[in-house]
Interface confidence: medium
């Protein structure tokens, strides 16, 4: 029997195809087999299907890189990674697409999802779309809709001050931050570590913490798949 | 727990100067931007400047601008309002208020308040 | 400068009942919207703030919701310390802005 998806566009198309176990898969963008791209396959997380595109769990990977870095993506996909802007923009451009955060620290958890989420082409420095939020962890991530991505080297932020080089990370940042995923690990100075702020507050740095996303209509996809 | 003590208002003849202070405590000052809101006697809030928490970033709304200036001491733990040119309209009770972070947010936390009154 | 636009500007209201302030803002301010609650002779309180979030120490029978430009303040059940002046506020944008106030009194 062949595949449902022979070239999987995205982490619910290879779950589609019957991949149930969370690790690293081959996508194809806008499935051109031309195209691959590596990436982790987070297939348990409610219902799984997610394309993990940050991870920060130890503090192994320095994040405090240059715009090049953020563009392309960097790390080791099965510990502390960035996927890389090109490829996010790439793959939300291919539909319509929902952000899953997931946060741990000592036995904590949270959670935020955003169910339509995209980031711009290179021309509009990769610029954050995230509305309709649910989920445990607060609605942080609104306060940086529509915003550019920002590094020390490329400040696109609203501050007179550059925020990347004040928080030594980078992000959709606006004035400065509510979110600061890409901060400093560990550190516990106020608005330096790993931030959400609706969660931990500017003065904690969380241990754990995943973006991912998948199709906004996977619910309906997996149903079909079901029935077949 | 945090304070916030304003002081410096008082009564001045319209065209004149005056300063208002701010000294705050309980919390790490310069963590935090901080507010200026003001309320005619009667009437609503209206929110008249802002500063980030380096100092680096000032804000101000349409009716003060250029006429009222905001900073502010971090080795004092001290915000300022300087209030040159001022006007009947700007009698006000003055609130100085903390942000709920260090960027232009949220005033979370309030001061009483110090009153300003113009009038010839 | 965006308008923030509240009603009731007055509403008399029995304990116990439940209260609805609207905020309308008079363009798209995302979620950024801000209640306060003032009493007679006092400094305003931070009630909520980023439309939904409950300030820490306040009791959970105020809530709030809404997002673009229209924002709702509740209080699922009033109480006698409830009577107060309620003030919406945008923070989106400098200068930030704030409505007109809402009275809640006795009825």
């Known amino acids: 029997i062949g595949l449902l998806y022979p070239f999987p566009r995205d982490c619910s198309q290879a779950m589609l195809n019957g991949d149930t176990t969370s690790g690293l898969y081959t996508i194809y963008i806008n499935g051109d087999k031309t195209q691959a791209l590596e990436v982790y396959c987070d297939m348990t997380s409610d219902g799984g299907g997610w394309i993990v595109f940050l991870r920060r769990k130890n503090g192994r990977e320095d994040f405090y890189r240059n715009w090049k870095a953020y563009a392309a993506g960097f790390g080791d996909r099965r510990e502390e990674f960035w996927l890389g802007l090109d490829n996010l923009s790439k793959i939300t451009a291919q539909g319509q697409y929902e952000l899953r955060v997931d946060l741990q620290d000592h036995g904590e958890s949270a959670y935020a999802v955003y169910d339509r989420f995209s980031v711009g082409d290179a021309k509009s420095r990769y610029k954050l779309k995230v509305e309709g939020y649910s989920g445990t962890a607060g609605d942080s991530m609104n306060y940086h809709n529509g915003r550019s991505f920002s590094t020390y080297d490329k400040d696109t932020d609203s501050a007179i001050t550059n925020c990347a080089l004040s928080y030594k990370g980078a992000f959709w940042y606006k004035n400065c931050h509510r979110v600061n995923l890409m901060g400093r690990y560990g550190d516990n100075n106020h608005s330096q570590g790993v931030n959400w702020f609706h969660w931990k507050g500017h003065e904690y740095s969380i241990q754990f913490a995943e973006m991912k996303l998948r199709p906004s209509n996977f619910r309906n996809l997996e149903g079909r798949r079901k029935r077949a | 727990q945090v304070q916030l003590v304003e002081s410096g208002g008082g009564l001045v003849q319209p065209g004149r100067s005056l300063r208002l202070s701010c000294a705050a405590s309980g919390f790490t000052f310069d963590d935090y931007a901080m507010h200026w809101v003001r309320q005619a006697p009667g009437k609503g809030l209206e929110w008249v400047s802002g500063?980030?928490?380096?100092?680096?970033?000032?804000y101000y709304a349409d009716s003060v601008k250029g006429r009222f200036t905001i900073s502010r001491d971090n080795a004092k733990n001290s915000l300022y309002l300087q209030m040159n040119s001022l006007r009947a309209e700007d009698t006000a009770l003055y609130y100085c208020a903390k942000d709920i972070s260090a960027v232009m947010d949220v005033p979370q936390t309030w001061g009483q308040g110090t009153m300003v009154t113009v009038s010839s | 400068d965006i308008q923030m636009t509240q009603s009731p500007a007055s509403l008399p209201t029995p304990v116990g009942d439940r209260v609805t302030i609207t905020c309308r803002a008079s363009q798209y301010i995302q979620g950024f919207l801000n209640w306060y609650q003032q009493k007679p002779g006092k400094a305003p309180k931070l009630l909520i703030y980023?439309?939904?979030n409950l300030e820490t120490g306040v009791p959970s029978r105020f809530s709030g919701s809404g997002s673009g430009t229209d924002f709702t303040l509740t209080i699922s059940s009033l109480q006698p310390e409830d009577f107060a002046t309620y003030y919406c506020q945008q923070s989106y944008s400098t200068p930030q802005t704030f409505g007109q106030g809402t009275k809640v009194d006795i009825k």
């Open positions: 980023d439309a939904s």
């Open positions: 500063i980030s928490g380096s100092g680096g970033s000032t």
